[in-house]
Amino acid sequence: VSPTFQVVNSIAPVQECSTQLDIVIVLDGSNSIYPWDSVTAFLNDLLERMDIGPKQTQVGIVQYGENVTHEFNLNKYSSTEEVLVAAKKIVQRGGRQTMTALGIDTARKEAFTEARGARRGVKKVMVIVTDGESHDNHRLKKVIQDCEDENIQRFSIAILGSYNRGNLSTEKFVEEIKSIASEPTEKHFFNVSDELALVTIVKTLGERIFALEAT
């Protein structure tokens, strides 16, 4: 080093990647979702990619149809293995209605509270999986805005199976589920042709969720 070398200013160290995320998965459990084991297979493949723990990523699951159930809270399990066991046991609760706005709003207001394990200053992520237009569509815009106001990153997944089986147009449905996703939509919205195809998006979805850790 040259004798004239001197430190003129100090550079802040490169920020470490945070491994902390609070993720709530919001599952449509209405009767039109079939087969349910395709949903549990999707959960299994997604969750086994996560480093779950009280100081790492936490995961909670909410299921909705006509009403909403907290399957488990963010702080319920402290390892990936425990969460995988619990997720496999989630039973489809059914219902003839798809109250997506209610599901999302309940996740925001309840699942992301400190009482249920949400951590201050930790990035909030919501993954919404549904196969049909919501029956409470009129509430959706406000519910999404409330999530936006609370900086909840949203990934939405549209399962087109029921529409394809009924030869119905998917246009309105896709439009609705796209509206749920955070911007940019093309990075936060997914659609699959049928329930069994859910597992095919796990790798990409996982990568995009983990990319949030670095931001």
């Epitope: 209405s30 009767n31 039109s32 079939y34 087969p35 349910w36 084991d37 549990t40 046991k89 039973v91 489809q92 609760r93 059914g94 003839r96 196969d131 049909g132 199976g161 029921s162 529409y163 394809n164 089986r165 009924g166 030869n167 119905l168 042709s193 049928d194 329930e195 069994l196 195809a197 095919t200």
Partner: antibody, heavy 125, light 107 residues
Framework: QVQLQESGPGLVKPSETLSLTCTVS????????WSWIRQPAGKGLEWIGR???????NSNPSLKSRVTMSVDTAKNQFSLKLSSVTAADTAVYYC????????????????????WGQGTTVTVS | EIVLTQSPGTLSLSPGERATLSCRAS???????LAWYQQKPGQAPRLLIY???SRATGIPDRFSGSGSGTDFTLTISRLEPEDFAVYYC????????FGGGTKVEIK
């Protein structure tokens, strides 16, 4: 009325691959899940796996590594391949349709396997 | 996986009698996804009941299903000669599994 017919060799050598086809007549293969089930002589029923008309599949975790399923919508057929067979795979193999009905719009109600093939006996020897 | 246990293994009854078959699941099953099948020797199974209690098309009303959660029952109110067969329950909410079967035989 939808009818299903299984076809394939009745005898397969150990370690080889069992291949069966199910032909759907009297209706379209589209928009349904289609399953394979087997039954060893004098025993109960075991689900092997299912294929959707789009080609998506899932299968029994205990057989997953050996099972391949596919669908040919042009021929109205779906097929099963089971690799590395042993004598324990000797059974009657059935194909079946997973039935559903619509309540309204896209709300379909599933009701299990409503149409079955008559079954085909496969012996591994 | 969800294990289904059927009892009794064999039921010996006379025509005209009432048959009650039980199916117990190792964990809760959505009642939307429990079915009953009848199988006669040399034949494929036939769907009798779906959604725990709904009769499939063409099934006579002497067959009825009930139950929820982990306990389900198939009842045949008055046995006809053609009802003597093996009966299987099946759950189709989480990777299809079948019970071991109950054989209803003539006493």
């Amino acid at each position: 009325q939808v009818q299903l017919q299984e076809s394939g060799p009745g005898l397969v050598k150990p370690s080889e691959t069992l291949s069966l086809t199910c032909t759907v007549s009297g209706g379209s293969i589209s928009s349904h899940y289609w399953s394979w089930i087997r039954q060893p002589a004098g025993k109960g029923l075991e689900w092997i796996g299912r294929v959707y008309s789009s080609g998506s599949t899932n299968s029994n975790p205990s057989l997953k590594s050996r099972v391949t399923m596919s669908v040919d919508t042009a021929k109205n057929q779906f097929s099963l391949k089971l690799s590395s067979v042993t004598a324990a795979d000797t059974a009657v193999y059935y194909c079946a349709r997973e039935g559903y009905d619509f309540w309204s719009d896209y709300y379909n109600y599933y009701y299990g396997m409503d149409v079955w093939g008559q079954g085909t006996t496969v012996t591994v020897s | 996986e969800i294990v289904l246990t059927q009892s009794p293994g064999t039921l010996s009854l006379s025509p005209g009698e009432r048959a009650t078959l039980s199916c117990r699941a190792s964990q809760s099953v959505s009642s939307s996804y429990l079915a009953w099948y009848q199988q006669k020797p040399g034949q494929a199974p036939r769907l009798l009941i779906y959604g725990a209690s709904s009769r499939a098309t063409g099934i006579p009303d002497r067959f009825s299903g009930s139950g929820s959660g982990t306990d389900f029952t198939l009842t045949i109110s008055r046995l006809e000669p053609e009802d003597f067969a093996v009966y299987y329950c099946q759950q189709y909410g989480s990777a299809f599994t079948f019970g071991g079967g109950t054989k209803v035989e003539i006493k």
